[in-house]
């Protein structure tokens, strides 16, 4: 079998949902010593970066300015050390937003409910679209999809305090081209009287994986790596 290097990690810096005409930044984290990184888009080569010096950095950033529907889709990356290529990274879906119109999000029976109540979100957009998406702030990877001509329902079932938080919806023109976001709707779920005060609201931190953790190798790291390699050889 043909030898390959471990697959790199691909991430979107800040978010995978990029407003049209804004810049997307994708990070490809491979390994120290990689002389070339390639970004692939829908299976075709999109961009190349050669880090300098290659032994001092474990990944690169690919910048995609002027985001539009032609650049929205599935991205992956690979890297090369010497003549040896890595496996392909997982696929990353890059979405362009702020296309066309703005939907309206509402919630029934209302934004303030008691734990155990059934809640349904409604997303409405009058321009032609059939797919709607509901996202909770701080959980942008957990996208709920629903279908309808001008309106879609998102039944939540009996809610708990874990459902608390801000929600937005989008109309989708295809999997990678979304409308402007709706205005947020904040769902407040009160629990049993004794533990209402204890139930924390859901954090609205940005998604932890939407950051680029590229590092430059210091002399100390290099010495430790060399020492570790020598120790491994001695143990053998």
């Amino acid at each position: 079998p043909k030898q390959t290097l471990p697959k790199p990690i691909i991430r979107a810096e800040s978010t995978y949902m990029v407003p049209k005409e804004k810049q997307a930044t994708l990070c490809c984290q491979g390994s120290y010593g990689a002389v070339e990184y390639q970004l692939h888009f829908e299976g075709s080569l999109f961009a190349v970066e050669r880090p300098k010096p290659p032994e001092r950095i474990n990944g690169v950033k690919f910048h995609i300015p002027d985001m539009n529907s032609r650049k929205a889709g599935r991205y992956s990356c690979i890297y090369r050390v010497g003549e040896l290529w890595s496996e392909r990274s997982d696929l990353l879906d890059l979405v362009v937003t702020e296309m066309y119109d703005t939907p309206t999000l509402s919630v029934h029976p209302g934004p303030e409910v008691t734990s155990g109540e059934k809640v349904t979100f409604y997303c409405r957009l009058d321009t032609a679209t059939s797919m709607f998406l509901l996202l909770k702030e701080g959980r942008s990877r957990d996208v709920q999809r629903s279908y309808g001509k001008v309106q879609a329902e998102f039944p939540m079932g009996p809610v708990t305090t874990a459902h608390r938080g801000s929600y937005r919806c989008f109309g989708s023109y295809n999997n990678y081209a979304w409308s402007f976001p709706s205005e947020p709707v904040k769902l407040l779920v009160t629990g049993d009287i004794e533990n209402t005060s204890l139930a924390p609201t859901d954090p609205t931190f940005p998604d932890s994986w939407d950051t680029c953790l590229l590092t430059r190798e210091t002399g100390l790291q290099k010495d430790l790596a060399l020492w570790d390699h020598t120790a491994q050889n001695l143990l053998r």
């Epitope: 999109f46 300015p65 650049k71």
Partner: nanobody, 126 residues
């Protein structure tokens, strides 16, 4: 707004050479990544060569060793030196730019480019 104007096209015999130029207007040239694409009659536009802000280059396999891309930031111009030309190099050659860009990315996919020239025709025939 960036405007790109290609020149240097013409008719040449197989084995001959040509140098294409692409003059860019605007102050953003130094922060632009540049590329050359070509389109032969009845075919799709294809990547030829590209250059990053800091002069890193990348070539299509079909032109590697024969074509050289370079840039002169003082003149806001990118060049494509073509040698050992073949009949299959006959096409309209387009200059393109990615503006703005950061880092040292070299762009290969046509979708990456947001500014395009009108093209210059290169014909290779005996």
């Amino acid at each position: 707004e960036v405007q790109l104007v290609e020149s240097g096209g013409g008719e040449v015999q197989p084995g001959g050479s040509l140098r294409l130029s692409c003059a860019a207007s605007g102050r953003t040239f130094a922060s632009a990544a540049m590329g050359w694409f070509r389109q032969a009659p009845g075919k799709e536009r294809e990547f030829v060569a590209a250059i990053s802000r800091s002069d890193d280059t990348y070539y299509a396999e079909s032109v590697k060793g024969r074509f050289t891309i370079s840039r002169d930031n003082a003149k806001n111009t990118v060049y494509l030196q073509m040698s050992s030309l073949r009949a299959e190099d006959t096409a309209v050659y387009y200059c393109a730019a990615v503006v703005p860009t950061y880092g040292n990315n070299i762009y290969v996919h046509s979708a990456a480019y947001n500014y395009w020239g009108q093209g210059t025709l290169v014909t290779v025939k005996p």
